[in-house]
C-alpha cells in the first residue's frame, strides 16, 4: 500500500528511473535474420537511478533502499525496471513465408524501482 511513494528525483531532472526511447534498426537489435518488419523500432526502456524511495514498486524495494544505505557493499540499490509493457506485433520470416507474431513484453510502458 505504501509503494511508489516518491516521484520527485533528488538527483536532478532526468537522472532517476524513467522511460527512455531509443530508435533502433533490425540490425542494431540483431533481428535482421528473422524479422522483416518494422525495419525500425522505437524501443522504450527503463533507465536511471533508484535513490531513496523513488518509485519504489513495493515494500521489498523500500527495505532494499534502507539496507543499501546501511550496507552499500553487500546490498545493491533497487533497479529501474519496467512496471508494465506495451505489446508489439512483428512480421517474421517463417519456413513457409511470413507470419505475424505478437510479443507482450518487448517494450516498456512505464517504470519503477525494485
Amino acid at each position: 500500500a505504501r509503494a511508489r511513494n516518491g516521484d520527485h528525483c533528488p538527483l536532478g531532472p532526468g537522472r532517476c528511473c524513467r522511460l527512455h526511447t531509443v530508435r533502433a534498426s533490425l540490425e542494431d537489435l540483431g533481428w535482421a535474420d528473422w524479422v522483416l518488419s518494422p525495419r525500425e523500432v522505437q524501443v522504450t526502456m527503463c533507465i536511471g537511478a533508484c535513490p531513496s524511495q523513488f518509485r519504489a514498486a513495493n515494500m521489498h524495494a523500500q527495505i532494499k533502499t534502507s539496507l543499501h544505505r546501511l550496507k552499500p557493499d553487500t546490498v545493491p540499490a533497487p533497479c529501474c525496471v519496467p512496471a508494465r509493457y506495451n505489446p508489439m506485433v512483428l512480421i517474421q520470416k517463417t519456413d513457409t513465408g511470413v507470419s505475424l507474431q505478437t510479443y507482450d513484453d518487448l517494450l516498456a510502458k512505464d517504470c519503477h524501482c525494485i
Partner: antibody, heavy 119, light 110 residues
Framework: EVQLVQSGAEVKKPGESLKISCKGS????????IGWVRQMPGKGLEWMGV????????IYSPSFQGQVTISADKSISTAYLQWSSLKASDTAMYYC????????????WGQGTLVTVSS | QSVLTQPPSVSGAPGQRVTISCSGS????????VNWYQQLPGTAPKLLIY???NRPSGVPDRFSGSKSGTSASLAITGLQAEDEADYYC??????????FGGGTKLTVLG
C-alpha cells in the same frame, strides 16, 4: 494531418474483377502498416489482412486467404485491395486503416469504399 | 460468430454511466491487450481506447477501458446523445491474428 482517402463506391457484376485504393498522406507511408477491414451490411468488422508498404510483405486472415490480394505502391503512397472474380457475397463496405506504432491497433481509418456486387 | 463476445445492445439515459463488456479466452484477451473503436452511424470506425486503458488525444476522459482476466470493459460516464453508436472491441488471437468483437449498439434514451 494524417489522412487515408479511399476510392469511390463501385457497382459490379459477379465474376468481374475490381481493385480499390487507399491513399495515405500526412505521414511517412512506408513507416506504418496498412490493414483492410470488411463490414458486410448490418454486420460487424472483419480483419482481412495487412501490408507493410515499405517491404510489400502481406499477411492475410485465414478467412480471406486466396480470396483477395493486397498490394501497395509506395511511390504514390497508395495501398490496394483487389478481387479477380467478385461474388455477390463480397458486397460490403471496405475500410483501410493505418496501424499504430506497435502494430496492435488501427489509429486512423479511411472513409470506406462501398462495393456492391449484383447481377 | 466472433471470437470476442459483446452484448448486441446496451442503453442508458443522458448523464448515466454504461459499460460494454468484451469476453474472450486465454488465447486472446487473456494474454494480450484490448482496443476499442466507436463507429458513429454512417461513418468509419474511430480508435477510442488502445492497449486496454489508453485514450488517444482528443478522446474525452468520459471513456475508459479496463481488462481483467479474459474479459475487458469499456465504460462511458456522463452519457451524451452523441455517444449513440456501435462499439467494437478488438484484440489479437493466436489463430486468427487481429480479431473483433461482434459490436454493441449503444442507445441513448430520449
Amino acid at each position: 494531418e494524417v489522412q487515408l482517402v479511399q476510392s469511390g463506391a463501385e457497382v459490379k457484376k459477379p465474376g468481374e474483377s475490381l481493385k480499390i485504393s487507399c491513399k495515405g498522406s500526412g505521414y511517412s507511408f512506408t513507416s506504418y502498416w496498412i490493414g483492410w477491414v470488411r463490414q458486410m451490411p448490418g454486420k460487424g468488422l472483419e480483419w482481412m489482412g495487412v501490408i507493410d508498404p515499405g517491404g510489400s510483405y502481406t499477411i492475410y486472415s485465414p478467412s480471406f486467404q486466396g480470396q483477395v490480394t493486397i498490394s501497395a505502391d509506395k511511390s504514390i503512397s497508395t495501398a490496394y485491395l483487389q478481387w479477380s472474380s467478385l461474388k455477390a457475397s463480397d458486397t460490403a463496405m471496405y475500410y483501410c486503416a493505418r496501424y499504430g506504432r506497435y502494430g496492435t491497433y488501427f489509429d486512423y481509418w479511411g472513409q470506406g469504399t462501398l462495393v456492391t456486387v449484383s447481377s | 460468430q466472433s471470437v470476442l463476445t459483446q452484448p448486441p445492445s446496451v442503453s442508458g439515459a443522458p448523464g448515466q454511466r454504461v459499460t460494454i463488456s468484451c469476453s474472450g479466452s486465454s488465447s486472446n484477451i487473456g494474454v494480450l491487450y484490448v482496443n476499442w473503436y466507436q463507429q458513429l452511424p454512417g461513418t468509419a470506425p474511430k480508435l477510442l481506447i488502445y492497449s486496454n486503458d489508453n485514450r488517444p488525444s482528443g478522446v474525452p476522459d468520459r471513456f475508459s477501458g479496463s481488462k481483467s482476466g479474459t474479459s475487458a470493459s469499456l465504460a462511458i460516464t456522463g452519457l451524451q446523445a452523441e455517444d449513440e453508436a456501435d462499439y467494437y472491441c478488438q484484440s489479437w488471437d493466436s489463430s486468427s491474428n487481429y480479431v473483433f468483437g461482434g459490436g454493441t449498439k449503444l442507445t441513448v434514451l430520449g
